[in-house]
């Protein structure tokens, strides 16, 4: 019978003994940096070329007996997970391990630093496909470490690593905690997140997605044929590194923010039990698990967007927090969130010659996020036009006006500290779907691109208030690039994007006050690509690729 | 990586004018940084990797490993240059007294200094 | 290219042990094992057993009952293969393959077990 | 370990296509992919044809190819040769050991 763990990675519409890709990854190379492994172990035979790296400390305690089996058992196991004849996920990847653990599975972030830049020096020296590096590994959080996965990551290797198995937030950790990594947290056969002893997975901003980690059988170094079940945010990543394989061999010229969008594109979505997470950590925890893509050909025609969340932006009141996209992606729309629901909004602002989306804190408010929006957007030319705060009670509107533009996102920003309850009349943008419509005392922000193809439109739910939570959501065949909240009023704790759906949240009914007059509209622009449609189906004849759910994106961090 | 998480300590230490007359001295105002890890257990004191700013050349950082060899000998320490990085970032590794954290973070291209610690197997 | 170069025929008498060497070149040795197949004369292959170059762990067919000792000198690159209390059953030719994919094959080495 | 069962000999014309059969159970066959098929001449070494079922090894002929539904596997060979008459043998995996077919003659009529 198929493994529990494979038979949850494969799309649904097939069954993991009838899913066999052509290559199974057989373009790529993943880079492996663990213990030593028994590569000849009857699983991985051939697969797994050991170099002759190795940059261990030694190993704790006078009695430590070297045995070969145990200095081999995390190693064999990933190896086996990733590439493994009987139980692996990219059967035709083949591997290079590196030593950078010890026999007791301890390494230095100065080993693994060297580890990385052998890896580099190696991709110089001898070119070759699509690079993988799998780092089931963590340390505390590292400047350094986390500088040079994002040198390597701007090489064009993809990164691989495990969140961590500390039941704790994975931006305390390296190099879980570097943006440019695709951080696994780690699930089990009931997708609840895994618990390790009195531990678990780790969670939070950090994590990319999760990936089964629990109970998943691989090669066991005991014999060369035997398996061992093993767990962990290890054996998650070695999963989405073997996921990424299968991807970059039937796509090679895929970048890493297409990789990672791809990856969030094709997770199963809301299937975890975030009851599990510790609450503050539960709306910045993407509820994704990792499968792999129901074909592979290309999914060039959608547009995909995932959700960025920015490290918390500390009590102070002039504090702000920044939420920023990857290089080769485009901030689409930016929003921010405040659990005491003190803020003072958002803007995105021009930072290094990039976008970014800056959210204010509030006099007597515990911090704010900001949360953007990030999309693959060929082509695309992007520009913010704000409008100041209005002083006729009709409130402030801004609107793309340049020819070619639309409005991708709304964001809003006031200086006073609170906007009252007193709302302005709110006037819907109908017709005039490139209009941002916000408070008189507020200043509002649009998010106007030109590409070629893209199309947008505007979709609202109003709901009378009282209500904590307000969604809406981008029907079949559109994406979600912008999320904001009309009217932007102090109840109004903030909006976000959860995979297509906009998300506006309120104060709990028993503490706002509120009249059950004052409507709470959650407003989200959807948008399509009719370009990468067409660019899509002249390469493929036609668009086979379709998702039969809905589209599927979440947040990554920095 | 932007340095608002907090999630690590960092220590700045100051740059003093009446250090030995250095050639290079660093870029007026810059202050190198140094970091060690949050976790107490997964420390490891005495050794120490010496980041280097980026568009540094490996000669550069291998005379610059050099120098704080001298200082630091002249001081009646003893130190050892484990790896010189190049190719991802510019630095090199260094074996040495934590006393000597002050005079490193004052040689010249120095960006920030990183204490060595433990990562594990997950 | 990978080769695997086996040691010559042997005639052994019933009751003797014979041991067989195999010499591997042109490939990482410590990412395969050595398996070693025979084949009694008229007869098929019969899959004997696997040792490792990396940690020298075996893997033995059941057949062997402990007759059978398979050993590997990496200084060397060479596998051997030594089978004891010989019987006229065991007169077979004798083969080294590469791994348990046995994708690469010695050229065989003739064993005759006669009184 | 019982040997897996195959036709003792097969036989077909130059040109022709032949299939030989290999049957196990779930234990070997069924139950892995990792169904290999070697050629061996009179007084040479096995060679490989097929590995993992349906793989081919960089030189040997697109002639040559396999495939397995439940615990049979096959080999396939198109367009027969006169230097195609050898004997086949297939081989599996098992949970700890490796399993030969008892071998297939192959003649060229």
């Known amino acids: 019978s198929i493994p529990w763990n494979l038979e949850r990675i494969t799309p649904p519409r097939y069954r993991a003994d009838e899913y066999q890709p052509p290559d199974g990854g057989s373009l790529v190379e993943v880079y492996l940096l663990d213990t030593s492994i028994q590569s000849d172990h009857r699983e991985i035979e051939g697969r797994v070329m050991v170099t002759d790296f190795e940059n261990v400390p030694e190993e704790d305690g006078t009695r430590f007996h070297r045995q070969a089996s145990k200095c081999d058992s995390h190693g064999t196991h990933l190896a086996g997970v990733v590439s493994g004849r009987r139980a692996g996920v990219a059967k035709g990847a083949s591997m290079r391990s590196l030593r950078v653990l010890n026999c007791q599975g301890k390494g230095t972030v100065s080993g693994t630093l060297i580890g990385l830049e052998f890896i580099r020096k190696s991709q110089l020296v001898q070119p070759v496909g699509p690079l993988v590096v799998l780092l089931p590994l963590a340390g505390g959080y590292s400047r350094v470490l986390n500088a040079a996965c994002q040198r390597l990551a701007r090489a064009g290797v993809v990164l691989v690593t495990a969140a961590g198995n500390f039941r704790d937030d994975a931006c305390l950790y390296s190099p879980a905690s570097a943006p440019e990594v695709i951080t696994v947290g780690a699930t089990n056969a009931q997708d609840q997140p895994v618990t390790l002893g009195t531990l678990g997975t780790n969670f939070g901003r950090c994590v990319d997605l999760f990936a089964p980690g629990e109970d998943i059988i691989g090669a066991s170094s005991d014999c060369s044929t035997c398996f061992v079940s093993q767990s962990g945010t290890s054996q998650a990543a070695a999963h989405v590194a073997g996921i990424a394989a299968m991807m970059l061999s039937a796509e090679p010229e895929l970048t890493l923010a297409e990789l990672r969008q791809r990856l969030i594109h094709f997770s199963a979505k809301d299937v975890i039990n975030e009851a599990w997470f510790p609450e503050d950590q539960r709306v910045l925890t993407p509820n994704l698990v990792a499968a792999l893509p129901p074909s592979t050909h290309g999914a060039g025609w959608q547009l995909f967007c995932r959700t960025v969340w920015s490290a918390h932006s500390g009590p102070t009141r002039m504090a702000t927090a920044i939420a920023r996209c990857a290089p080769d992606e485009e901030l689409l729309s930016c929003s921010s969130f405040s659990r005491s629901g003190k803020r003072r909004g958002e803007r995105m602002e021009a930072q290094g010659g990039k976008l970014v989306c800056r959210a204010h804190n509030a006099f007597g408010g515990e911090g704010v996020y900001a949360i953007a929006r990030c999309c693959l957007l060929p082509q695309a030319n992007c520009s913010v036009h704000t409008a100041p705060p209005a002083e006729a009670s009709m409130g402030t509107r801004v609107h793309c006006h340049q020819q070619g533009h639309v409005l991708t996102g709304c964001s809003s920003h006031w200086e006073v500290e609170d906007l009252g309850t007193h709302k302005p009349p709110v006037l819907r943008p109908r017709g005039q779907p490139n209009q941002c419509v916000g408070h008189r005392e507020a200043s509002i922000h649009a998010s106007c691109c030109h590409a070629p193809g893209l199309e947008c439109k505007v979709k609202e739910h109003g709901i009378p208030a009282p209500q904590e939570q307000v969604t809406v959501a981008c029907e079949e065949g559109w994406t979600l690039t912008g999320c904001s909240a009309l009217p932007g009023t102090s109840h109004v704790l903030g909006a976000y994007a959860v995979d297509n759906t906009c998300v506006v949240r309120s104060r709990d009914v028993s503490t706002t006050g509120s009249t059950s007059e004052e409507a709470v509209t959650a407003v989200a622009i959807c948008c399509r690509s009719r370009h990468l449609a067409q660019a899509s189906q002249e390469l493929q004849g036609s668009s086979d690729y379709k998702d039969d759910d809905k589209h599927h994106h979440h947040h990554h961090h920095h | 990586q932007e340095d608002e998480d907090g999630d690590y300590e960092e220590l700045v230490l100051a740059l003093r004018s009446e250090e030995d007359g250095l050639a290079e001295a660093p870029e007026h105002g810059t202050t190198a940084t140094f970091h060690r890890c949050a976790k107490d257990p997964w420390r490891l004191p005495g050794t120490y990797v010496v980041v280097l700013k980026e568009e540094t050349h490996l000669s550069q950082s291998e005379r610059t490993a050099r120098r704080l060899q001298a200082q630091a000998a002249r001081r009646g320490y003893l130190t050892k240059i484990l790896h010189v990085f190049h190719g991802l970032l510019p630095g090199f590794l260094v074996k040495m007294s934590g006393d000597l954290l002050e005079l490193a973070l004052k040689l010249p291209h120095v960006d920030y200094i990183e204490e060595d610690s433990s990562v594990f197997a997950q | 290219q990978v080769q695997l170069v086996q040691s010559g025929a042997e005639v052994k008498k019933p009751g003797a042990s014979v041991k067989v060497s195999c010499k591997a070149s042109?490939?990482?040795?410590?990412?395969?094992?050595i398996s070693w197949v025979r084949q009694a004369p008229g007869q098929g292959l019969e899959w004997m057993g696997w040792v490792s170059f990396y940690n020298g762990n075996t893997n033995y067919a059941q057949k062997l009952q402990g007759r059978g000792t398979m050993t590997t000198d990496p200084s060397t690159s060479t596998a051997y293969m030594e089978l004891r209390s010989l019987r006229s059953d065991d007169t077979a030719v004798y083969y080294c393959a590469r791994g348990y994919g046995m994708d690469v094959w010695g050229q065989g080495t003739t064993v005759t077990v006669s009184s | 370990q019982s040997a897996l069962t195959q036709p003792a000999s097969v036989s077909g014309s130059p040109g022709q296509s032949i299939t030989i059969s290999c049957t196990g159970t779930s234990s070997d066959v069924g139950g892995y992919n990792s169904v290999s098929w070697y050629q061996q001449h009179p007084g040479k070494a096995p060679k490989l044809m097929i590995y993992?079922?349906?793989n081919r090894p960089s030189g040997v002929s697109n002639r040559f190819s396999g495939s397995k539904s439940g615990n049979t596997a096959s080999l396939t060979i198109s367009g027969l040769q006169a230097e195609d008459e050898a004997d086949y043998y297939c081989n599996s995996y098992t949970s700890t050991s490796m399993v030969f077919g008892g071998g297939t003659k192959l003649t060229v009529l």
């Open positions: 042109g490939y990482t040795l410590t990412s395969y094992g």
């Open positions: 993992e079922v349906s």
